[in-house]
């Protein structure tokens, strides 16, 4: 009555598991199993994960922590979140770069490399979607530029240049002879 009851120790629940001779309480996230409990329903001896290692979940049998991943510099990856005792390093791309998956069915754990985002301004185009999870999506040509082939060409500044039909429609004047 009053106060919280400790979890029942039946070896079948989430809190206690048979480790060695007895049902033992598991180790919390960020800790590994040094030695199992020495009495029924006792606490195992748990130690904090050493530097550069982690365990993300409560566990009963892990006698060592997982090594933190190193972000792949060759793939231009950077650490978005450093490794802690309870979480692995989170690798990603620096601002101005986007994730290009190295496999077709891309999931969070898939290998990837970082690609520089397209600079729509340098291509004289509007930015339609900013670059984050995928490359920048560039839109139509900026004012003063018209579509020519794959690129944007600057409107002529004098009557000497040629101005095809698309140029005339965007730049607002026709070629003069």
């Amino acid at each position: 009555q009053g106060g919280t009851r400790s979890p029942r120790c039946d070896c079948a629940g989430d809190f206690h598991k048979k480790i060695g001779l007895f049902c033992c309480r598991g180790c919390p996230a960020g800790h590994y199993l040094k030695a199992p409990c020495t009495e029924p329903c006792g606490n195992s001896t748990c130690l904090v994960c050493p530097q550069d290692t982690f365990l993300a979940w409560e566990n009963h049998h892990n006698s060592e922590c997982a090594r933190c991943q190193a972000c792949d510099e060759q793939a231009s990856q950077v650490a978005l979140e450093n490794c802690s005792a309870v979480a692995d390093t989170r690798c990603g791309c620096k601002p101005g770069w986007f994730v290009e998956c190295q496999v077709s069915q891309c999931v969070s754990s898939s290998p990837f490399y970082c690609q520089p985002c397209l600079d729509c301004g340098a291509l004289h185009r509007h930015t339609r979607l900013l670059c984050s999870r995928r490359d920048t999506d560039c839109g139509t040509c900026l004012p003063g530029f018209y579509e020519h082939g794959d690129g944007c060409v600057s409107c002529p500044t004098s009557t000497l240049g040629s101005c095809p039909e698309r140029c005339a429609a965007v730049c607002g004047w026709r070629q003069m002879f």
């Epitope: 039946d10 480790i19 060695g20 001779l21 007895f22 020495t38 009495e39 029924p40 329903c41 049998h61």
Partner: antibody, heavy 123, light 111 residues
Amino acid sequence: EVQLVESGGGLVKPGGSLRLSCAASGFTFSSYAMSWVRQAPGKGLEWVSTISDGDSYSYFPDSVKDRFTISRDNAKNSLYLQMNSLRAEDTAVYYCARDRIYGSVQYYAMDYWGQGTLVTVSS
Amino acid sequence: DIVMTQSPDSLAVSLGERATINCRASESVEFSGTSLMQWYQQKPGQPPKLLIYAASNVESGVPDRFSGSGSGTDFTLTISSLQAEDVAVYYCQQSRKLPYTFGQGTKLEIK
């Protein structure tokens, strides 16, 4: 019929090593925790080590921790005790015993014992 | 560690009489309503033999003149009618927590 037969005892100098064996028969060896208990000449019983059944975790009192290791080979129905850095006070008859678990209370009692093997540590 | 203390250290009883051996634990050996302790008999030149488990349960094959009682920290082994073959040293032992510990033993003789 359950049988436990120890071997490997003998005379060894202080600081020396010895490996005891226990051959088990008459029961499903892999399903039981197993223990070593010793008895110095004219003295009482002292628990030395236990190894669990499934995951083979080992347990020791402080008096032998870091000097003794316990292991098992379920395929050979055998239990072992590797004793290193032996001291005069380790002189004893070493018994191998089966640990029977009773009910769901995680309660063990040593229900079968071998005849023992004598270890003498002396220079 | 749990210390197990037996009394008396030695005991002489006439054949057919009752023999009583006591064992006290330095802390409770109860768990989940069960006393995690047992009694062993060791005859000269032989290994120990399990007589009683969980304080009061007689191991199969053990004569019914042997009985155990008690709970918590205080336990008793009783031989209701002593027989010649009962001459031995008797040990209590706890399995409540590691390290497992034994009493120092009680030597039972015939008066």
